[in-house]
């Protein structure tokens, strides 16, 4: 049994780090492998993560952790029974992938404006709470040529779009993702998308 692609891990800077790797051949990850992790810290214990399959040769493990601080450093050992397949380390604060924003809602009852709101995925006491900026992707299933990214660089999780910039009488979808500039994170996954119908019509005298 051999590791083809070494484990790569990212942290949500809250309570979970996710490690993914590829094996040299088809593997029943949960039956054959264990990922052991231990914080480099006085009197810490070794904890075990049971991986899941992620495609035929891929494995993924969700490591449960305490809150993340910049000093945290983990040793990682990938075992197949009594055989050590790989040994490495992981510093969560240096490999952050934020959680995806949630509760994306479209408000169309505001005159002339489409208002999109969503929730910050972190509690106020988390360091990322006040550091997230967002990208909102809006596209149309009726008009495949239409897809826009709106960068939201302010803290408030809202975006206002003049309804007149969207075509009337067709449906649109939106999704949102986040990143934290000061933590040099990757982008989060996209939130689930939400759909709405743009029924806005310009006033008669403007046509």
């Amino acid at each position: 049994m051999k590791v083809l692609q070494e484990p790569a891990c990212v942290s949500d800077y809250m309570s979970i780090s996710t490690c993914e790797w590829k094996m040299g051949g088809p593997t029943n990850c949960s039956a054959e492998l264990r990922l052991l992790y231990q914080l480099v810290f006085q009197s810490s214990e070794t904890h075990t993560c049971v991986p899941e399959n992620n495609g035929g040769v891929g494995c993924v493990c969700h490591l449960l952790m305490d809150d993340v601080v910049s000093m945290d450093n983990y040793t990682l050992d990938l075992w197949a029974g009594q055989q050590l397949l790989w040994k490495g380390s992981f510093k969560p604060s240096e490999h952050v992938k934020p959680r995806a924003p949630g509760n994306l809602t479209v408000h169309t009852n505001v005159s002339d404006t489409v208002l999109l709101t969503w929730s910050n995925p972190y509690p106020p006491d988390n360091y990322l709470y006040n550091d997230l900026t967002y990208a909102v992707n809006i596209w149309s299933e009726n008009d495949p040529a239409y897809s826009r990214i709106h960068n939201v660089t302010y803290l408030k999780p809202t975006l206002r779009i003049p309804a007149s910039t969207l075509k009337s009488g067709i449906s649109y979808r939106a999704r949102v993702r986040a990143w934290a500039q000061h933590y040099n994170t990757t982008w989060s996954e996209w939130s689930p998308s939400t759909k709405w119908y743009n029924s806005y019509r310009e006033p008669f005298e403007q046509r």
């Epitope: 009197s43 214990e45 305490d66």
Partner: antibody, heavy 125, light 112 residues
Framework: EVQLVESGGGLEQPGGSLRLSCAGS????????MTWVRQAPGKGLEWVSS????????YYADSVKGRFTISRDNSKNTLYLQMNSLRAEDTAVYYC??????????????????WGQGTTVTVSS | DIVMTQSPLSLPVTPGEPASISCRSS???????????VDWYLQKSGQSPQLLIY???KRASGVPDRFSGSGSGTDFTLKISRVEAEDVGFYYC?????????FGQGTKLEIK
Amino acid sequence: EVQLVESGGGLEQPGGSLRLSCAGSGFTFRDFAMTWVRQAPGKGLEWVSSISGSGSSTYYADSVKGRFTISRDNSKNTLYLQMNSLRAEDTAVYYCAKDRLSVTVRPRYYGLDVWGQGTTVTVSS
Amino acid sequence: DIVMTQSPLSLPVTPGEPASISCRSSQSVLYSIGYNYVDWYLQKSGQSPQLLIYLGNKRASGVPDRFSGSGSGTDFTLKISRVEAEDVGFYYCMQSLTSPYTFGQGTKLEIK
């Protein structure tokens, strides 16, 4: 009531051995790291050794490394310090103390919040 | 190893007056914000040490509020707002960030 009671001290000749015990009660013994601290006559406190809750991680002062062994039996709620190749400078009162909660991924520290009454070890010919 | 240096080593105090003991570590014992791995212990004559302050500034259960801890990084202070006769004994600071745990030399507090 959370309590630690040491035993096993006594008079031993240089080069001899002693085994100290520390019985814990009133808390979930296996969840906590444990520590031994000693105090030579008229001197200050000196850390000797620590062990994680499961016993998988052990730590020693340079002055005792290779001679002393810390261990624990969580089924008996008891901590041990096996002392071999004793020297005159090991003469001290030995205290066991309850250390950090080590079952969490990052052990939670509340100080050495419970101490035993101490057991006296005298090494002399 | 982290060296802990206490001062003063002897502290005569009048009852009711404040007292202050300093402890300096040879390297930072700050792990993360609010987590300075420094404790303060009091050892009264003929007794086991007892915990007063942990993580730099957190008062242990049952410790009177006249005791307080402060500081961060490498410089720490134990303050007693109004010394009482029962406070006499040796005070030790200790770092527990990493083994070997190390203690200060001890400060003897006595009543004038």
